[in-house]
Interface confidence: low
Amino acid sequence: AVNGTSQFTCFYNSRANISCVWSQDGALQDTSCQVHAWPDRRRWNQTCELLPVSQASWACNLILGAPDSQKLTTVDIVTLRVLCREGVRWRVMAIQDFKPFENLRLMAPISLQVVHVETHRCNISWEISQASHYFERHLEFEARTLSPGHTWEEAPLLTLKQKQEWICLETLTPDTQYEFQVRVKPLQGEFTTWSPWSQPLAFRTKPAALGKDT
C-alpha cells in the first residue's frame, strides 16, 4: 500500500529521452512501478521501470528512439503516468500532462578540450550533445573553474548568454593545475533547467618564463 504525498518530475532532453523522478513519502513495499508515456499525437507509447535512487525516490529514462532523432516537437503533449503493481492490477500513482519543450534539461556538454594554453590564460572548447535543431543559437552556458585549495561550490560562475561553445579563461596562475566544467540551458521553457555539469577537464597552465616578472 502507498500513503503520503508524491512528487513526479520529468525533463525532456530535446531529442529522444524523457528522464523522470518520482518521490513518495509513504512506504512502497516490494512494489514494481513504471512510468508510462502516452503522446497525444504520436502512434508510439513507451514505458520504463522505476528504479530506486534513494529510500523514497525512484528514477527512470524513457528512451523514445535513436539518441539524435527528433521524437517530439513544441506542439506535443505527453501524458505521463506512474503505475505501480497492486496484485494483478496496475494503480495510477501520479499523472501529468507533460509539455516537452516547457520542461527541458539537455545532456551535459561533451568533448571538452584545451585549444590553447599559456601562462595566464587557457582557451577551451566543447560540444553540445543530443540538442534539438529547433534551438538554433538560442542556448546559454555556465562555466566554472576549480582552482587549487577551493571546492566546486566556491568557484564563481561564468555566464555565456549565447550559443558560444568555447571560452577563454584569463588571469590564471602560471604552472597551476585547474579543472573546468560547463553546462547548457535552452532559453525556451517555463520549467527548463540547467543540464548536468560536464565531466571536468583538467589542464595545467604553462610555467612562467625564467627571468621575467609574472
Epitope: 513544441t74 529547433y134 538554433e136 543559437r137 525556451q188
Partner: nanobody
Framework: QLQLVESGGGLVQAGGSLRLACALS????????MAWFRQAPGKEREFVAS????????DYVASVQGRFTVSRDNNKNTVYLQMNSLKPEDTAVYYC????????????????WGQGTQVTVSS
C-alpha cells in the same frame, strides 16, 4: 507597428504552382520566426509551414511535406511559400504569421497575422 502583407494568391489548376510572399514592416525582420497558416471554408485555421529567424530550420504539416517549400529573404524582409503539385484540398485563405518565439509559432493566439490571400485550386 508590426504589419504583415501577403501577396501571390490566385486561381490555379490542380497540379499547378503558386508562390506566396509576405512582407514584414514595422520591426526588425530577423527577430521573427515566420509561418504560413491556412483556413479552408468552414474549417479551423491550420499550421502549414514555418521558418526560423536565420532560415536554417523549417517545419511542415505532413500534408504539404515535399510539395511546399517555405523560405525567407532577410534582406527583403520577406517570407515565401512555394506551392507545387497543388490539390483542390489546398484551397484556402493563406495567412502569414510572425512570432519572436519559434516555440510559440504554431499557437494561434500569440502570433501577429497578415490579412490573408486566397488560393483556389480547381480540378
Amino acid at each position: 507597428q508590426l504589419q504583415l502583407v501577403e501577396s501571390g494568391g490566385g486561381l490555379v489548376q490542380a497540379g499547378g504552382s503558386l508562390r506566396l510572399a509576405c512582407a514584414l514592416s514595422g520591426d526588425v525582420f530577423v527577430r521573427y520566426t515566420m509561418a504560413w497558416f491556412r483556413q479552408a471554408p468552414g474549417k479551423e485555421r491550420e499550421f502549414v509551414a514555418s521558418v526560423t529567424d536565420s532560415g536554417r530550420t523549417t517545419d511542415y504539416v505532413a500534408s504539404v511535406q515535399g510539395r511546399f517549400t517555405v523560405s525567407r529573404d532577410n534582406n527583403k524582409n520577406t517570407v515565401y511559400l512555394q506551392m507545387n503539385s497543388l490539390k483542390p484540398e489546398d484551397t484556402a485563405v493563406y495567412y502569414c504569421a510572425a512570432n519572436t518565439d519559434y516555440f510559440q509559432i504554431r499557437s494561434l493566439d500569440r502570433n501577429t497575422w497578415g490579412q490573408g490571400t486566397q488560393v483556389t485550386v480547381s480540378s
